[in-house]
Interface confidence: low
């Protein structure tokens, strides 16, 4: 059975040309975190794995960099980075959870962060 | 389907090195993480360093940074494991794996293994 949560930075905003932090946090299991990916809708920017640690997908290696933690920082972002960014935890036993990010690259100045909020 | 093929190991005495190689077949190496890992006896399989397809991002397990690198040579599908400055507590054996990118299970394709031996 399923008992864990993800919290995520939930829906953010930013500057384009700035930097983001993705942070998503697994909480309510003891379920043992084999790897984390991190995907763009269809691409998978990075995985965090357990045994072989950090790789980032080589299409991104430039804009993106590991940590902190288990979150992901997305660099030099243009218009074109805005959408929808997903954690998966994979883990044993439970399974898979995946917790959802909404990231919206500004023009102006008026990048200010969303709350955060619990993905069941 | 990867089949793994390990080779370099041997006795050496502490101080030494040696230069492990792992030839793969059957799939090119630019969708995987390329990975060494080591057992030595009444111990767990633990990682020591892994490369991604590309060869831009490496990872190494504390006990080694300085004195190991990993390295990939794409057009002989080949990935390398340069050991320098060996250590007695080096002594076990090493295996080479190839993890595809989208990697969701605990391991994949394994390589037979290779012994290394450091003598004090």
């Known amino acids: 059975m399923m008992t864990g949560t993800i919290e995520t930075t939930g829906n953010i905003s930013a500057e384009k040309g700035g930097s983001i932090i993705l942070q998503c946090h697994l909480s309510s299991t003891t379920a043992q975190v084999t790897q984390v990916n991190w995907e763009q809708q269809d691409q998978l920017l990075a995985i965090c794995n357990a045994d072989l640690g950090w790789h980032i997908s080589p299409s991104f290696k430039d804009r993106v960099a590991p940590g902190p933690g288990l979150g992901l920082t997305l660099q030099s972002l243009t218009v074109n980075d805005t959408g929808e960014y997903f954690c998966i935890y994979h883990t044993y036993p439970d399974g898979t959870y995946t917790g959802r990010i909404f990231l919206e690259v500004l023009e102006s100045s008026v990048a200010e962060h969303g709350a955060r909020f619990q993905i069941p | 389907e990867v089949q793994l093929v390990e080779s370099g190991g041997g006795l050496v005495q502490a101080g030494g090195s040696l230069r492990l190689s792992c030839a793969a077949s059957?799939?090119?190496?630019?969708?995987?993480?390329m990975g060494w890992f080591r057992q030595a006896p009444g111990k767990e399989r633990e990682g020591v360093a892994t490369?991604?397809?590309?060869?831009?991002?490496?990872y190494y397990a504390d006990s080694v940074k300085g004195r190991f690198t990993i390295s990939a040579d794409n057009a002989k599908n080949t990935v390398y494991l340069q050991m320098n400055s060996l250590k007695p507590e080096d002594t076990a054996v090493y295996y080479c794996?190839?993890?595809?990118?989208?990697?969701?299970?605990?391991?994949?394709?394994w390589g037979q293994g290779t012994q290394v031996t450091v003598s004090s």
């Open positions: 794996a190839a993890v595809p990118w989208r990697w969701t299970t605990r391991r994949d394709y």
């Open positions: 059957g799939r090119t190496l630019d969708d995987y993480v």
């Open positions: 490369i991604s397809g590309g060869g831009d991002t490496t």
